[in-house]
Each structure stands twice: as C-alpha cells, then as structure tokens.
C-alpha cells in the first residue's frame, strides 16, 4: 500500500531454481526397417538444461532427425516447395523456410514427388505435427523449487523467500500455504487458467511473478514475497510468427569417419521468474 | 512525454527470440595430410544455442582445436613464451596467457623453437588470428522475430509486441515497418551505424532496446513499442581487455578408448534485447 | 547522494564477462577394477559454460555417473528405500527422491541390502557426498574480466566500467584499486566474508553488485561504478530445501550401438551480476 | 515398397571384373550399393546421388570399383576391376534418401573371388 511519506527503493532480486521428476516416454521408434514400441525414462539431465537466473526450461515435447550428414538431398515437400523440372530450382538461393541451399536440380524426394535439391543437414528434418498427446506429459506432476533473494541496498535490507521455519516437503496452494515456494507445475498452469496438457503439446512460457510490497519499517514491519502466475506467450498467435516456444539443438557425433548429427526440435515450457516490488521506509 | 498528474510504473518484461537463416561455409579442410576446400552448412542447431529470455547468441566466426588429448606437450610459443633451458620453466606454474600447468623443462616446440613443457589439452591450441573474412559472415542476412510481452502489475495492464493485425512476412523497417518486429541483423547493425562484415570476425554485443512509453488513460491511450539499436561492446578496446566477443566451449569423444576432444573458440554477435519504459495512469 | 531538484533515471544495464584459469584436479580412476590416481586439467572450456548475460557458473566439484543404459536395475538404497518383499514396491511409482520408476520388485542391491527395482538410467546415481576439498578448489586463484556497459536513455548518456586509461593487468582491490574490474575470484569471497575452499564443496551464489550513482549535471559531473560483494544462497539452509549449487548434465554417446550417458553432478559458484543505480541531472 | 532385383553376381579370380546391374520398381534419388562378408556385419560399397550427383565409394574400394545410374530406367550399376578375395560377400542393391542413408535393400548377389 502507498505510504506517501516512505522513502521507495526497487528490488534487487537473485533467483536460483531446482525442477524434480521423471518422465515415463513412450514412442515408436524404428530399427533396421522394424518399427516398435520404446520405453524410456526421462530425468531432470535429459529434460532440462543448466540456465542462469531468471528462467528454467522444461522439455515437453520433442521431434528427433537423427543420422543426419552434411551432402545433398531432395529438400521436405512442404507446400508449395514441389518442382517438375530445374527451372524451379535456383542455384545458391537459400528459402527461409528451408534447410539448405539450393543446387538448382529438381529430383525425386519420393515415387511421387519431385523437389528441389539442396546442400544441407540430410535427410532433410520433415515438417510433422508435434507429437499429441505430448510425449513428456506427465511433466505436469514435476516440481520446481524456488529460491529467491532480494535486497533493498538503499535501506541495507536482504531477506530471502525461504524461512528457517518452512517445510521442505510442502507444495504451494493460494490458500493453503501461499508461502510455500515449491511449486507444482500442473498447479502453476491451473492458478493462471491454463491447460498444461495442451500447452505442453507446442510449448509455451509461463510467468511466476514474485512481488514484494515492503515496508521496512521498524514499527509496522512487513516484507513477505506473493506469488502469481500468468502465461506470457500468445496462445492465439498466428503460424507466422511461430506459436508455443521450442528450439532446435544437436548432438553431434561420428560414425565410421563419417560426421553426423541428431537434430532435436524440442518443445517445451520456459518459465520466466519475474521478480518485482519496493522496500519502503521512513 | 512526462504527464506530473499521472502514476508511473515501470515495466515487467519478457522476451522470446528466434533465429532463422541458413550459411553457407567455405574453409580449408586437411584429412590425411592432405588440405582441400570444404564446404559445410550451418543452420539454427549448428550456429546458435539454447539460451533463455533477453539474449541470444549468432556464431559468425570460429577457430577450431581438434583431437586435444590430456597429456604432456610444448605450450604454443606466443611472444615471451620460448625458452632455452630448463630454468625458463618453473615446474607447477601456470601461465594466465598459457593453457596448462608447466612440469620444469624446456622442449622443442618445432625445428627452430622451444618451450616450456606443460600438462594440458594437447597440441595446445594455437593462437591464431580469427579468420577474415568471417566463417559465418552471410549471418547478416539472417533473421530474428523478437516477442516481448509486457505487464503493468499496479495498473493490471498487459500487452504485447506483436498485435493480430501483424503479417509474418514482414522485415522491421525504422521508416517504412517501424512496428514489425522481425529484424534482420544487418539492418540492426546499420541503424546502429555499425558494419557487421567487420564486427563478425571478432564478434560483439549489440544492443536492441524496446522502449515502452505507455499512456494508460482510456481517453488517451497509447502503449506500442519503439525499437532503437546501439553497440555495446567497446570497439576501441585494449587488447589486454578481450576485445569482441568469444567464448571456448569444446565437443568430448572418445577414440581408441582414449578420452578426447574438440575446443571451439567462437566468436559472434551476442544480441541484448533491453526493454524500459513506463505506464503512467491516472 | 539525493539531489532532489535531479531528474533521476533508473540505469539500463549490459554484461560480459570473461573467466581466466587452469585447474589441476587429483581424483580416484577406477579402469578394469584396478583403482590409481588420476591427474587431469581443467580449463574453461571444461568448466564454465557459454552463458548470457548477468550470470556466470564456475564448477568447483563435481560427481560423475559414468556409462549409464536406459534398463532395470535396483534403485540405490538411501536411507528408507530397502525393501524385504514385493510388496514395499508399487508398479508405476516414482518417488521424487529416486532415479527411476518402480516395476514393482524387491531385488538385491548388493549381498546384504535390497531394494525396488526401478526403470532407469543404471546403474543409478551413488547418492555419495561432494568430495572434499573439492576438486577444483584452485579456482579461487581464477580471475574474471567483467565488462559493464550503462544506459541512461532518458539523459541520452552512456558509458562503461573499464576507460581507455585503464591497465589490462590489473587485480581489483578494495582500497588500492577500486575501480579494476579483475576480480580474483578468491577475493570476492573475502570481501563477502566468505571462505572459498568451504563453499567449492556443495557451491553457492555469489552476487557482485555494481552500483552507479551518476551525477550527469555538467558542474558537478561523476558517474563511476563502486563494486560489492555479497553471498545470495543460504548456507544455514535445510537438507530439504537443497543447499548449495548444483546441477546435472549429461553427456551421451554410443557404445556397440548402445545408447549411453555419463551423468555430471556439477558444484560450483553462480556469480550474479547486480547492476542498479541512477543517473540524475538538472 | 521399392522392389529391387540385383543381378551380375558369379565366381571370378583375383585381379578379374565384374559389372552387378540393379533395377528398382519406382524412381529414387540415391542407388547404392553394400555387401556382407560371412560371419561380418552389412558394410557400405558405392553410392549414387540423382543423375550420378553426388557419388560416394567405401575408402576400400575407391579407384577400383565404379557407380553409375541410368536415372530413366531406374537402374544403378557397380563396375569391379582389380577384384580380391576380401571383396567376397553378397553384395545388396539399395535406394534411398541421399548417399549416405538408404531405406530399401534387394535379396542380394553372391559375388566370389577365387585367389
């Protein structure tokens, strides 16, 4: 609350943040021709990566092309990417919404069609649908723990939102335990009107505002954090400007003196740490 | 504009990136002793990385170190670094400049020169001039959407970068486009009155600044954002200050059961996106 | 110092930092049963990582989980997770402490404990303490150039933490040489009243808090950055609320076409960069 | 499914040739050839982009052995001089992606190199 006659100072805020859970995935995946059924475990080591400060991601979802090579090959048939003849095809014109550069050969991609070739990561990463339901779903159940320190240097006040008193096994509830700064991913979407499972399926950011209204003085002392939660990406956003929040990344390796990669397209939930408020004094 | 009636707050922000382009890169290859002319093509996976909320990251130059072993070798002979006999080399020191820990004897580093022996990642990496032109310099033509969501919590007030109204194919022009918000990166470099050919070899930071001025009153409303460019890093820097932007990450296999690895000096564009502002109310 | 006829300004504020050192770690190497010591070096491609902004991570310690398959295998008896009977084990459950999730048997664990047999990474991770000293403890002789560039749009004034007049060879000293931006990394501690050997074990956040204080009017001008030093994670904290600073990461690889990972335990200091202050002018 | 028939498989000595042809059901952008040896693992030999764009050979058998397409008939060809009795195996027709990843494989070709 405004207290005209308070010296107001902002917060200087650190944040660290600590995600727990495994995933059970279950996926085709294909072998010498054969497809079946794979079973893996996904823990924080496969699912997470070591990000600074303000923000942790968490996988969701993914789509792998693997033994890739660096050679040519016919490019994705996407639409409008088709050819019947060279004509078509541009030498060293590179397509924004693809993934190498043209040779300026049109050439079989399959019994059917015919598409440009390009110099590129090879067999070109095919533009499919993200798996649904996503395949890290269960990551709703996952919890991440919170830690957060704030410092008014103008008033020499630090406090942080972690007391000696509090229970390192509960789960935070608005009601319940408002305090309580391990935090319930699935909860974190339901507090902000959000559905994890269909969120998870693209990808999304999420926000975890954490406001700090502080009044340091000594006689009416108050500074205690309030959490809130809003998701901060556009989940009407047009296919152009690249809806959800996902990544490519790539695991490089060699085999038989050959340099190739496994390319991920992974999706998932960036959550942001959005950490506000004043201390205000007399 | 300063409204003295109005409540100011300032703004809670966050930022989603993503990059697109593909280039194309000629370099000397040598396999088997023998030197020839490789190509190679480098796309999202390959010249960028995950990176969280108001930075990102454009390889457009590297050094590469193959095939380091831990083990004993010459240090590279760098000016002040050769010796002539065992008492130039002082067994457990290191260097700052050197990249191991030297064992007290002075070897021959080739046919004309010695140094001081040392522990380390060898051969130890060479310190050679960052190729010029740029590996990566066609990243110029590259592209990054920036989505910058916005929040005034005292005046519960959000919005966003990138309105429904918005056509995905646009290009941010200050004059013609001013409110797209996808940029390609040469013309941020231009409007900052900088030459990205030049800053690519030895990377730098470059600045993206989203300026929210927001009038939050109904009769007078206004809250869109205004985007401005400058260099952060200090191009006249000392050597002795690391000027540019470079960092080592390295690739570990193994070979022959033997632990080895990849050193990675890259250099690039390291892009801060700093978003300020204010909404002021009634 | 308040001038309260000032327009004062809140700083915008960029980063770089860049870490220099060479650790040499002596740990236990177990290959084909025999147990020897092993000398390795650790440069900063090997621990740090390429990271944005106002952060950076220097790994100090570290617990490795080598050559981990994705199979069943018991799970590592913890104090609680010894079973005697099936019955202990539920199909499907996933205990937020565990590795893995449940198939529903009690198996042997060694000759005299068991415990449930879980879907995995295996074998799963020794839960064994940080080793002591740690590892990398020279890291306190480490040093880090921090670059700082600030922003006051509003005064249209901008400058940087490291003038042309500065020596590249430089250590930061609170007294002999305040405005040095190379810091020893052991020098931060002390200044923070923190012991560095100590705190390598199970790692920490450390903050390095710039303050500019900026005085833009022409007659009275001064805009110079004071460096402090204080530690931002709890070192009294709870087991349960995690202490420390840690993280894994993987490394995966193939083995006669077996999908395989060295998981890393990594311990280190997080070094947060908090820039604040104001430019104030007539 | 791509249906491959090899032929030109048979007994020959050391130092002789051999032309293999392979003709596939439909029209692919790469025809290459493997073979597997007894008692060792299928290994790649020669492969052929479209129009004989790009080709790649297996290091033992670069200088010796020649690719070649015929893109409208849908055939691909191995031409071995210089032959050795370690070139003793089946040898497999295949098609595929790009040069270096292939999808369909024939039943295979017994070649045998007497010393």
């Known amino acids: 609350s405004d207290k005209l006659y308070q010296r107001k100072e902002p917060v200087i805020s650190s944040v660290h943040t600590k995600v727990k859970g495994i995933a059970e995935v279950t996926e085709n995946v294909t072998e010498g021709g054969v497809t079946k059924l794979g079973h893996s475990i996904f823990d924080t080591a496969d699912y997470t990566f070591p990000l600074q400060g303000n923000s942790f991601f968490v996988m969701t979802n993914y789509v792998k092309s693997e033994g890739q090579v660096q050679t040519l090959c016919p490019e994705y048939p996407r639409r409008g990417a088709q050819c019947s003849s060279d004509r078509r095809c541009k030498k060293g014109w590179m397509d924004p919404q693809s993934k190498g550069i043209q040779t300026g050969r049109c050439v079989p991609y399959d019994k059917t069609r015919k598409t440009c070739e390009v110099s590129a990561w090879c067999p070109t990463e095919e533009e499919k649908e993200a798996p649904r339901p996503a395949l890290l779903r269960s990551a709703e159940n996952f919890t991440v723990l919170i830690k957060n320190n704030i410092h008014f240097p103008g008033h020499n006040y630090t406090t942080r939102n972690i007391l000696p008193t509090m229970n390192g096994s509960c789960t935070f509830h608005k009601t319940w335990d408002p305090q309580c700064s391990i935090f319930r991913l699935g909860d974190i979407f339901q507090e902000a009107g959000e559905n994890f499972t269909e969120v998870a399926v693209q990808g999304g950011i999420m926000g975890i505002e954490i406001y700090w209204d502080c009044n340091l003085d000594s006689w009416s002392h108050h500074c205690r954090p309030r959490y809130s939660f809003r998701r901060l990406d556009d989940k009407n956003m047009d296919e152009s400007f690249v809806p959800g929040y996902n990544f490519r990344y790539a695991k490089y390796y060699k085999e038989n003196n050959v340099e190739k990669r496994t390319l991920i397209k992974a999706f998932g939930i960036r959550f942001d740490i959005l950490v506000f408020g004043t201390g205000g004094k007399f | 504009s300063d409204k003295l009636y109005q409540r100011k707050e300032p703004v809670i922000s966050s930022v989603h990136t993503k990059v697109k382009g593909i280039a194309e890169v000629t370099e000397n290859v040598t396999e088997g002793g023998v030197t020839k002319l490789g190509h190679s093509i480098f796309d999202t996976a390959d010249y960028t990385f995950p990176l969280q909320g108001n930075s990102f990251f454009v390889m457009t130059n590297y050094v590469k170190s193959e095939g380091q072993v831990q083990t004993l070798c010459p240090e590279y002979p760098r000016r002040g670094a050769q010796c002539s006999s065992d008492r130039r080399c002082k067994k457990g020191w290191m260097d700052p400049q050197s990249k191991g820990i030297q064992t007290g004897r002075c070897v021959p580093y080739d046919k004309t020169r010695k140094t001081c022996e040392v522990s380390a990642w060898c051969p130890t990496e060479e310190e050679k001039e960052a190729p010029r032109p740029a590996l990566l310099r066609s990243a110029e033509n590259f592209t990054v959407l920036i989505k910058n969501n916005i929040h005034f919590p005292g005046h519960n007030y959000t919005t966003r970068n990138i309105l429904p109204t918005m056509n995905g194919s646009c290009t941010f022009h200050k004059t013609w486009d001013p409110q797209c918000s996808i940029f390609r990166l040469g013309d941020i470099f231009q409007e900052a009155g900088e030459n990205f050919t030049e800053v690519a070899v030895q990377g730098g930071i470059m600045g993206i600044e989203i300026y929210w001025d927001c009038n939050l009153d109904s009769w007078s409303h206004h809250c869109r954002p205004r985007y401005s460019f400058r260099r952060l890093d200090d191009k006249n820097m000392d050597e002795s200050f690391v000027p540019g932007y470079n960092f080592r990450y390295a690739k570990y296999y193994k070979e022959n059961n033997v632990e080895k690895r990849t050193l990675i000096k890259a250099f690039g564009i390291r892009f801060d996106i700093l978003v300020f502002g204010t909404g002021g109310k009634f | 110092s308040d001038k309260l006829y000032q327009r004062k300004e809140p700083v915008i504020s960029s980063v770089h930092t860049k870490v220099k050192g060479i650790a040499e770690v002596t740990e236990n190497v177990t290959e084909g049963g025999v147990t020897k010591l092993g000398h390795s070096i650790f440069d900063t491609a090997d621990y740090t990582f390429p990271l944005q902004g106002n952060s950076f991570f220097v790994m100090t310690n570290y617990v490795k989980s080598e050559g981990q398959v994705q199979t069943l295998c018991p799970e590592y008896p913890r104090r609680g997770a010894q079973c005697s009977s099936d019955r202990r084990c539920k199909k499907g459950w996933m205990d937020p402490q565990s590795k893995g999730i449940q198939t529903g048997r009690c198996v042997p664990y060694d000759k005299t404990r068991k415990t449930c047999e879980v879907s995995a990474w295996c074998p799963t991770e020794e839960e064994k303490e940080a080793p002591r000293p740690a590892l990398l403890r020279s890291a306190e002789n480490f040093t880090v150039l921090i670059k700082n560039n600030i922003h006051f749009p509003g005064h249209n004034y901008t400058t940087r933490n490291i003038l042309p007049t500065m020596n590249g060879s430089c250590t930061f000293h609170k007294t002999w040489d305040p405005q040095c931006s190379i810091f020893r990394l052991g020098d931060i501690f002390q200044e923070a009243g923190e012991n560095f050997t100590e705190v390598a074990v199970q790692g920490g956040i450390m903050g390095i808090e710039i303050y500019w204080d900026c005085n833009l009017d022409s007659w009275s001008h001064h805009c110079r950055p004071r460096y402090s030093f204080r530690r931002l994670d709890d070192k009294n904290m709870d087991e349960s609320f995690v202490p420390g600073y840690n993280f894994r990461y993987a490394k995966y690889y193939k083995e006669n076409n077996v999908e395989k990972r060295t998981l890393i335990k990594a311990f280190g200091i997080r070094f947060d960069i908090l820039v604040f202050g104001t430019g104030g002018k007539f | 499914e791509v249906q491959l028939v090899e032929s030109g498989g048979g007994l020959v000595q050391a130092g002789g040739s051999l032309r293999l042809s392979c003709a596939a059901s439909?029209?692919?952008?790469?025809m290459g050839w493997f073979r597997r040896a007894p008692g060792k693992e299928r290994e790649f030999v020669a492969g052929?982009?479209?129009?004989?764009?790009?080709?790649r050979y297996a290091d033992s058998v670069k200088g010796r052995f020649t690719i070649s397409r015929d893109n409208a008939k849908n055939t691909v060809s191995l031409q071995m001089s210089g032959l050795k009795p370690e070139d003793t195996a089946i040898y497999y027709c295949?098609?595929?992606?790009?040069?270096?990843?292939?999808?369909?494989w024939g039943q295979g070709t017994q070649v045998t190199v007497s010393s």
């Open positions: 052929s982009g479209w129009d004989g764009i790009p080709t």
């Open positions: 439909e029209r692919t952008y790469s």
């Open positions: 295949a098609t595929g992606t790009s040069v270096y990843h292939y999808q369909y």
